[in-house]
């Protein structure tokens, strides 16, 4: 039975050209992390995989940066940015809990973060 | 872009043979590296692979014998008492290990292992 | 130890015709398949990765499908550059394996 749940930033927004931080958390659940992936609609961002560390796509290898912990830095956002990104954490023995986060960016004014909340 | 550095060539089974692929324009610091091999006229098969922490898998044919290392922006195979079998063309790629495929490959270089 | 099986070792088609290339797991792999293309004198290009997903600059004309243990790889419309020896390479497990690729299957385009 999965008991564990994902708390993630929520819903995010940044500015143009600046940076962001993705992160999730999982709590509630003894499961072993053993891989943890960010994605952005299909396509592969980055992983951290608890034997090999981390792997950073090639087509996103000069814009994101791994950490802090299991989280992710975006950097140089342009509006492109905006939408929906996914923390996908493979345990074992419970399997995959997938949080979402939702990044806006702006063309200017100053960057708000949204409030924290949980998906189970 | 992903280069094989070092050229093949022909080797003795008393030698010790060592691959160095090159990674340009960015550091392997984030990157999964494998090695692949091919005999003439057979398949593709997997040797190995480095995380970017250092921590490495091989094929269990070739663990004890071959050896993959890492600097920022290198990785080295090295293969101790290469036989005749060992002759293939050696590729380096990107990724590898639930990276979504391995991906741009290195362009290869043939080892041919005679005594 | 994970073991690739890919079917059949080489197939004949004619240009604009289809090809299905199969590659079976020996347990599940949760479809952590990808398919490279390879001519002679090259190294593999990508072509599908994550069992169905289409790598980048890669015609629409291949597509990938499956799951568990079962997956497969079609070429429809095919063209003469399609003619190339394509493998299927599992990414659900590295310890204990002999191989993650199949044993390939060569295209034919007549």
């Known amino acids: 039975m999965m008991t564990g749940t994902i708390e993630t930033t929520g819903n995010i927004s940044a500015k143009k050209g600046g940076s962001v931080i993705l992160q999730c958390h999982l709590s509630s659940t003894t499961a072993q992390v053993t891989q943890v992936n960010w994605e952005q609609q299909d396509q592969l961002l980055a992983i951290c995989n608890a034997d090999l560390g981390w792997h950073i796509s090639p087509s996103f290898k000069d814009r994101v940066a791994p950490g802090p912990g299991l989280g992710l830095t975006l950097q140089s956002l342009t509006v492109n940015d905006t939408g929906e990104y996914f923390c996908i954490y493979h345990t074992y023995p419970d399997g995959t809990y997938t949080g979402r986060i939702f990044l806006e960016v702006l063309e200017s004014s100053v960057a708000e973060h949204g409030a924290r909340f949980q998906i189970p | 872009q992903v280069q094989l550095e070092s050229e093949g060539g022909l080797f003795k089974p008393t030698d010790t043979l060592t691959l160095t692929c090159t990674v340009s324009?960015?550091?392997?610091?984030?990157?999964?590296m494998s090695w692949v091999r091919q005999a003439p006229g057979k398949g593709l098969e997997w040797i190995g692979i480095?995380?970017?922490?250092?921590n490495t898998y091989y094929a269990n044919w070739a663990k004890g014998r071959f050896t993959i290392s890492k600097t920022s922006t290198t990785v080295e195979l090295k293969i101790t008492s290469p036989t005749t079998e060992d002759t293939a063309t050696y590729f380096c790629?990107?990724?590898?290990?639930?990276?979504?495929?391995?991906?741009?490959w290195g362009p290869g270089t043939l080892v041919t292992v005679s005594s | 130890d994970i073991v690739m099986t890919q079917t059949p070792a080489s197939v004949e088609v004619a240009v604009g015709g289809t090809v299905t290339i199969k590659c079976q797991a020996s347990?599940?792999?949760?479809?952590?398949l990808n398919w490279y293309q390879q001519k002679p004198g090259q190294p593999p290009k990508l072509l599908i990765y994550?069992?169905?997903k289409l790598a980048s600059g890669v015609p629409s004309r291949f597509s990938g499908s499956g799951s568990g243990t079962e997956y497969t790889l079609t070429i429809s419309g095919v063209e003469s550059a399609d003619a190339a020896t394509y493998y299927c390479?599992?990414?659900?497990?590295?310890?204990?394996?002999?191989?993650?690729f199949g044993g390939g299957t060569e295209v034919v385009v007549k």
């Open positions: 790629a990107r990724g590898g290990y639930r990276t979504s495929g391995m991906d741009p």
């Open positions: 324009g960015s550091s392997l610091s984030s990157s999964y």
């Open positions: 480095i995380g970017s922490n250092g």
């Open positions: 347990q599940s792999i949760s479809s952590y």
């Open positions: 994550d069992a169905l």
């Open positions: 390479q599992q990414e659900h497990s590295v310890g204990n394996v002999d191989n993650v």
